[in-house]
């Protein structure tokens, strides 16, 4: 029977900068029941506080609700593992909520084949930002990425959409059924999970030739003229 091994705080995530959760990995239990507590202080503060909510985030977690989430403060936290034989502490982790945001996936992805008489056909997709994100405050800039593939293909084709919530793709294989997904990330932070797949059948008469693979400003439409060279660089096949 031994004191517990050193725990490790391995992840902190926020869905929207308004709340966040941190998770830790227990060390070895030393063969005895072990209690864990997370304590923290905000940078510049001389007091220590205990985790406000050990329940919401599941086992080995600490959840900070709205009333405990400060945007412009660094949190300094550590986990203490204790059993009858002694204690051990994790390393301190410094957390700034601004940099740990992982949003929910975008919502309401709709995909349509557009075949205008006077222009080349294209695949048009549109989506909404996740509901927890309030873009009106200006705290957030969300970037989007789309991926699609024929149903039976192994490889995804990925396109970077910048801040747009709609996108056009020209290069598709006629007669194929495609899966389309979208994900988002804040300017600082982590990519969301991919949205649930939306399926679209590309008509057999969908005209495609090599020159259509070029994405021009004209093809992208007025709303997408702000796309940068860096963004265009992301329009590649994976």
């Amino acid at each position: 029977q031994l004191p517990p091994g050193k725990p490790e705080i391995f992840k902190c995530r926020s869905p929207n900068k308004e709340t966040f959760t941190c998770w830790w990995r227990p060390g070895t239990d030393g063969g005895l029941p072990t209690n864990y507590s997370l304590t923290y202080h905000r940078e510049g503060e001389t007091l220590m506080h205990e985790c406000p909510d050990y329940i919401t985030g599941g086992p080995n977690s600490c959840h900070f609700g709205k009333q405990y989430t400060s945007m412009w403060r660094t949190y300094v936290m550590m986990v203490n593992a204790t059993n009858q034989m002694g204690s051990s502490f994790s390393d301190e982790l410094y957390v700034d909520v601004t940099y740990i945001v992982q949003p929910d996936p975008p919502l309401e992805l709709t995909v349509e084949v557009k075949q205008p008489e006077d222009r080349k056909p294209y695949l048009w997709m549109k989506w909404s930002p996740p509901t927890l994100i309030d873009l009106k405050t200006g705290w957030f800039t969300l970037l989007y990425e789309i991926r699609l593939k024929p149903e039976k293909a192994a490889e995804w084709e990925t396109h970077f959409a910048g801040q747009q919530t709609e996108f056009k793709i020209l290069s598709l294989h006629p007669g194929q059924k495609y899966l389309v997904q979208v994900r988002c990330k804040p300017d600082h932070g982590y990519w969301s999970a991919w949205s649930p797949a939306t399926f679209i059948q590309i008509p057999s008469d969908f005209i495609m030739n090599d020159e259509q693979k070029l994405i021009s400003e004209e093809d992208l439409g007025g709303e997408q003229k702000l796309i940068s060279e860096e963004d265009l660089h992301h329009h590649h096949h994976h």
């Epitope: 510049g44 503060e45 001389t46 007091l47 506080h49 406000p52 009333q67």
Partner: antibody, heavy 121, light 107 residues
Framework: EVQLVESGGGVVRPGGSLRLSCVGS????????MNWVRQGPGKGLEWVSG????????NYAESVKGRFTISRDNARNSLFLQMNSLRAEDTALYYC??????????????WGPGTMVTVSS | EIVLTQSPGTLSLSPGERATLSCRAS???????LAWYRQKPGQTPRLLIY???SRATGIPDRFSGSGSGTDFSLTISRLEPEDFAVFYC????????FGPGTKVDIK
């Protein structure tokens, strides 16, 4: 309207006890750290005790540690201060005070009108 | 315990004048954790400024706060009749403490 109302003050002999109560209304009581602050007659403000909204660790000024006990009942939007072994220097107007956030150690943005405690033989 | 000292103890000014109140801490305070209050005679204190320079809800822009380290100040650009009162600074980086107050009275 956001408000706090204290009760339970009165006159007590040295060594006696009193229990102060505070009821909050017009806001989500369990979103805020809560505190007691006192002000002796003609004197300045002195923080007495406070704790975070989830009822975590309690915190006390050195002058009252071991004699006063703070507690709260979020279901009843209530904060309490049990005062034992009272001394003449505890004579003051006692304010129930809300912290701006979930932490008790924050700026105090809502104050009750206060309840007067007089310790005298 | 962090001790706060306020100066001057009393400030005698006329309505419309500018007032600058000082608050000094016994040790360095992160600027996120300093507040100012006004207490009019016979009334409860009211939060004016938090985080050294952020105005509380409903506080007019004649009040401004500044400072860092151990030296902080509250400036009232034009004194109104309701500003003749006692002003307290407070730190909340540790267990909260208040300064002894500065009384602003009419000259």
């Amino acid at each position: 309207e956001v408000q706090l109302v204290e009760s339970g003050g009165g006159v007590v002999r040295p060594g006696g006890s009193l229990r102060l109560s505070c009821v909050g209304s017009g806001f989500s009581f369990d979103d805020h750290g809560m505190n007691w602050v006192r002000q002796g007659p003609g004197k300045g403000l002195e923080w007495v005790s406070g704790f975070n909204w989830n009822g975590g660790s309690t915190n006390y000024a050195e002058s009252v540690k071991g004699r006063f006990t703070i507690s709260r009942d979020n279901a009843r939007n209530s904060l309490f201060l049990q005062m034992n072994s009272l001394r003449a220097e505890d004579t003051a107007l006692y304010y129930c005070v809300r912290g701006r956030s979930g932490w008790f150690n924050d700026a105090f943005d809502v104050w009750g009108p206060g309840t007067m405690v007089t310790v005298s033989s | 315990e962090i001790v706060l000292t306020q100066s001057p103890g009393t400030l005698s000014l006329s309505p419309g004048e500018r007032a600058t109140l000082s608050c000094r801490a016994s040790q360095t305070i992160n600027s996120n954790y300093l507040a100012w209050y006004r207490q009019k005679p016979g009334q409860t204190p009211r939060l004016l400024i938090y985080g050294t320079s952020s105005r509380a809800t409903g506080i007019p822009d004649r009040f401004s706060g500044s400072g860092s380290g151990t030296d902080f100040s509250l400036t009232i650009s034009r004194l109104e009749p309701e500003d003749f009162a006692v002003f307290y600074c407070q730190q909340y980086a540790g267990l909260p403490t208040f300064g002894p107050g500065t009384k602003v009275d009419i000259k």
